[in-house]
């Protein structure tokens, strides 16, 4: 369970892949699409509000046996919209929702490979946000393998402005 209903901290950042492609968000037909693309030099990077929560996660709740205090994150690129895991479709989607947010909007934060991070689905341990065919997708990672595979690694570049909301 999330130990507190309010985040311990928040920050505004742009999100890019390990290979420095930008994660961008576009409003199309009243819904948001998520793209992974090379940005033109003069184009401004899209911002994401990252809200960090603590979670006490007993091992009985997860298949991977991970037990203890986890740092979880929600990602919101625009007001009232959050990234969510769709485990059935193995997809990452933007949905409008109200608080309290559903579990599908929470991701366990992994610090990886110096200053990269990975996002593991709270609802599906061992499944991470990753890049597939220039889109974000859910990717199953075998825990016996090294979690450092580049397609699940992301870089956060903090944007130094007040984070009360954006777009």
């Amino acid at each position: 369970s999330i130990t507190g209903i309010s985040p311990i901290t928040e920050s505004l950042a742009s999100l890019s892949t390990y290979n420095d492609q930008s994660i961008t968000f576009a409003l199309e037909d009243e819904s948001y699409e998520i793209y992974v693309e090379d940005l033109k030099k003069d184009k401004k990077k899209d911002k994401v509000l990252l809200s960090y929560y603590e979670s006490q996660h007993p091992s009985s709740e997860s298949g991977d046996g991970v037990d203890g205090k986890m740092l979880m994150v929600t990602l919101s690129p625009t007001k009232d919209f959050w990234l969510q895991a769709n485990n059935k479709e193995h997809s990452v989607e933007l949905h409008k929702c109200e608080k309290p947010l559903p579990d599908q909007a929470f991701f366990v934060l992994h610090n990886r490979s110096f200053n990269c991070v990975s996002f593991e689905c709270k609802t599906d341990p061992g499944v991470f946000i990753g890049v597939k065919d220039n889109h974000l997708a859910l990717i199953k990672v075998d825990y016996s393998e090294n979690l450092g595979s580049e397609n699940i690694l992301f870089k956060l570049s903090e944007i130094l402005e007040h984070h009360h909301h954006h777009h």
Partner: antibody, heavy 122, light 107 residues
Framework: QVQLVESGGGVVQPGRSLRLSCAAS????????LHWVRQSPGKGLEWVAL????????YYADSVKGRFTISRDNSKNTLYLQMNSLRPEDTAGYFC???????????????WGQGTLVTVSS | DIQMTQSPSSVSASVGDRVTITCRAS??????LAWYQQKPGKAPNLLIY???SLQSGVPSRFSGSGSGTDFTLTISSLQPEDFATYYC?????????FGPGTKVDIK
């Protein structure tokens, strides 16, 4: 309660090797990243190395890279630091420390061992 | 590597005093800063993490604030057991780095 107990320190000549151990209890050892941090006598704290909860990722301070190796045995709840090619400047108390969060180092270190002293001198 | 500086390097205070220690990072570290207390011959003890979150079991007279590059640890009413050295540590960027410490001693 959480306990971390280091051992293996001692006096060693420059160029020689030493292996430190840290026995852990009171928490799910295999769920947490673990660190070695050192403190020279009368000085401040210096982070040395980190191993991820599953042992798949290891990171080192530049000052020890290529000489020190961090490892863990999750079946024995034990963390290790193999120190080779020791130098006088490696003289310090060595602490093992547990990450506050399972998979993230953002929270710092919530539990520390009592330390073991390593003296490198001819 | 991110350099951490602390001020003052030492402070003399009396029981009941309000003590403030500042920590500055050479570049922005968001809120990922921890504070530790260390007594002679002992291991450091985590007081505050994420700049302002009080670690379980730590008395509420300890508080932390700040984000970006400037941070503060405040002891609202110094107790006899608080005389120690205090270190800040940035946990945002690799490698983790510590401040040089602030020694709080008896006036």
């Amino acid at each position: 309660q959480v306990q971390l107990v280091e051992s293996g320190g001692g006096v060693v000549q420059p160029g020689r090797s030493l292996r430190l151990s840290c026995a852990a209890s009171g928490f799910t050892f295999s769920s947490y990243g673990l660190h070695w941090v050192r403190q020279s006598p009368g000085k401040g704290l210096e982070w040395v190395a980190l191993i991820s909860y599953d042992g798949s990722n290891k990171y080192y301070a530049d000052s020890v890279k290529g000489r020190f190796t961090i490892s863990r045995d999750n079946s024995k709840n034990t963390l290790y630091l193999q120190m080779n090619s020791l130098r006088p400047e490696d003289t310090a108390g060595y602490f093992c420390a547990k990450s506050l969060y399972t998979t993230s180092w953002y929270g710092g270190f919530d539990y520390w061992g009592q330390g073991t002293l390593v003296t490198v001198s001819s | 590597d991110i350099q951490m500086t602390q001020s003052p390097s030492s402070v003399s205070a009396s029981v009941g005093d309000r003590v403030t220690i500042t920590c500055r990072a050479s570049q922005g570290i968001r809120s990922w800063l921890a504070w530790y207390q260390q007594k002679p011959g002992k291991a450091p003890n985590l007081l505050i993490y994420a700049a302002s979150s009080l670690q379980s079991g730590v008395p509420s007279r300890f508080s932390g604030s700040g984000s970006g590059t400037d941070f503060t640890l405040t002891i609202s009413s110094l107790q006899p057991e608080d005389f120690a050295t205090y270190y800040c540590q940035q946990a945002n960027s690799f490698p983790p780095t510590f401040g040089p410490g602030t020694k709080v001693d008896i006036k």
